[in-house]
Amino acid sequence: PPRGRILGGREAEAHARPYMASVQLNGAHLCGGVLVAEQWVLSAAHCLEDAADGKVQVLLGAHSLSQPEPSKRLYDVLRAVPHPDSQPDTIDHDLLLLQLSEKATLGPAVRPLPWQRVDRDVAPGTLCDVAGWGIVNHAGRRPDSLQHVLLPVLDRATCNRRTHHDGAITERLMCAESNRRDSCKGDSGGPLVCGGVLEGVVTSGSRVCGNRKKPGIYTRVASYAAWIDSVLA
C-alpha cells in the first residue's frame, strides 16, 4: 500500500512544484520524493523497507499519476542510499537518496529544489508547504493529481509533550501542526518547503493523521547536510 496522505489540503497548481517526485514500486506510487540535484532524489528510508524484490522507479515532471503529460518521465534507480543510521523501528535518520539512471531532463516542470544547509530551526508559526499523492481522507481515497497543504511549524517543546510525541523529537527533527490538515505516512519522503527552500522530509513512521495532538514529523535536511553532500559528491 502507498505510504502517505495529504489531509485537508487541495489540488496543487499543475507543475508549480517542479522538484516533486513520486517514488514508485512496481509502477505504483509508494512515497513522495524531492529532486535535490540533476541525478538525485531525496526521500525517506522507510519507504524502501518492503521493496526488496520490487522495481523501484522515480516519476518526475508529473501532476497526474495516470494521465499523459509532456513533462512526465519515469526514471530507473541506479543506486539507493539509505542513511546508514536509519532503522526500521525508529523515526530517526529517516532519509534516502536515490540516484537516477541518468541525469534528469530539466525544464519548467522538472527542477531541483535548493535545500537548507544552515542548521537552525525554522521559527514556530512559519507556514510551510507540503505536497504529495497520498490518500486525501480517512476512507483512503487516493488522489490522481498532486495535493498540497500549508502547515505552521510547531515548536519542539510542544511536540515533545507526553500527549504529543513524548520526547521523541530530537534536534534533527521538526514538527508541523496537524489539526485536520496534515501530511501522513505515504506522503513520506515528500518535501516540507519553507520560503522556497527544502527544510524537511516527511518521516514515514506510522502515525495518526489529522489529530492536533499528534503533529507531523519531518526530518530536518540541514542536520544532514554533511551526509547529503558526501553521497552526492
Partner: antibody, heavy 116, light 112 residues
Framework: EVQLQQSGPELVKPGASVKISCKAS????????KNWMRQRHGESLEWIGD????????NYNQKFKGKATLTVDKSSSTAYMELRSLTSEDSAVYFC?????????WGHGTLVTVSA | DVLMTQTPLSLPVSLGDQASISCRSS???????????LEWYLQKPGQSPNLLIY???NRFSGVPDRFSGSGSGTDFTLKISRVEAEDLGVYYC?????????FGGGTKLEIK
C-alpha cells in the same frame, strides 16, 4: 547527561515571597516543557504547572493560580518558580521536572520552610 | 480533577516475593488522542521520583523487566515479580491525560 540543578533550601517568613530556580544542562533547554511539583512532608505529589521555554507560556493548576508564577531565562537555561503570600501550608519540597519522555528527569528538589 | 486512588497504602513484602499495587482513577484516563497516559514512579527516601512505566505498560529505559504495568480505562496495576532491596520506597501512579495531571496517594513498599 541530562541534569536539572535546583537552588538550595529556603527559610522564609509568612507573607513573604520566594523564587526558586532549576538550571538545565545536557540538552537543549528550549526543546522540552518544564513542570513543577509540590510535595509536603510525608504526602504525595501535586502538579503546580508547566511552562514552554520557547515563549514563556505557562499553564497552572487552578489550585496554585495566584500562588505560583513560572518564568524562564533562555540565556541561562534556567526555569524559575516564584511563590508568594507564603503560609505554613506552603512548606514543602518543590521539584522541577522535564516533560519528555514523561517525567523522566527531575531536579533533586528545593525545601521551602515557612516559619516565623 | 481526576482522583487517583492507590491500594494498599502500605505493602509489607519479603525479598523475592511478588508485589502488586492497584491504582484506580475517578474517570477514564484515555486521552482524546486515543492513548492512556498512566505512569508509575518510585520515590526512594530523600530522593526525587524515578519513572518506571509510561503509557500503562511501557518500561522506561534501564528499568528491570521484573516491573510490569497493566490495565485500561480506570483500573491499573503495577507488578514487581521478585522484590529486591533496591525496590523499596513509595510508588506513585500518575495520570497525564487530563488537566491538571494528578498523582495517586502513594504505596509504601517495605520489608515484612
Amino acid at each position: 547527561e541530562v541534569q536539572l540543578q535546583q537552588s538550595g533550601p529556603e527559610l522564609v517568613k509568612p507573607g513573604a515571597s520566594v523564587k526558586i530556580s532549576c538550571k538545565a544542562s545536557g540538552y537543549t533547554f528550549t526543546d522540552y516543557y518544564k513542570n513543577w511539583m509540590r510535595q509536603r512532608h510525608g504526602e504525595s505529589l501535586e502538579w503546580i504547572g508547566d511552562i514552554n521555554p520557547n515563549n514563556g507560556d505557562a499553564n497552572y493548576n487552578q489550585k496554585f493560580k495566584g500562588k505560583a508564577t513560572l518564568t524562564v531565562d533562555k540565556s541561562s537555561s534556567t526555569a524559575y518558580m516564584e511563590l508568594r503570600s507564603l503560609t505554613s501550608e506552603d512548606s514543602a519540597v518543590y521539584f522541577c521536572a522535564r516533560e519528555g519522555p514523561s517525567f523522566a528527569y527531575w531536579g533533586h528538589g528545593t525545601l521551602v520552610t515557612v516559619s516565623a | 480533577d481526576v482522583l487517583m486512588t492507590q491500594t494498599p497504602l502500605s505493602l509489607p513484602v519479603s525479598l523475592g516475593d511478588q508485589a502488586s499495587i492497584s491504582c484506580r482513577s475517578s474517570q477514564t484516563i484515555v486521552h482524546s488522542n486515543g492513548d492512556t497516559y498512566l505512569e508509575w514512579y518510585l520515590q526512594k527516601p530523600g530522593q526525587s521520583p524515578n519513572l518506571l512505566i509510561y503509557k500503562v505498560s511501557n518500561r522506561f529505559s534501564g528499568v528491570p523487566d521484573r516491573f510490569s504495568g497493566s490495565g485500561s480505562g480506570t483500573d491499573f496495576t503495577l507488578k514487581i515479580s521478585r522484590v529486591e532491596a533496591e525496590d523499596l520506597g513509595v510508588y506513585y501512579c500518575f495520570q497525564g491525560s487530563h488537566v491538571p495531571p494528578t498523582f495517586g496517594g502513594g504505596t509504601k513498599l517495605e520489608i515484612k
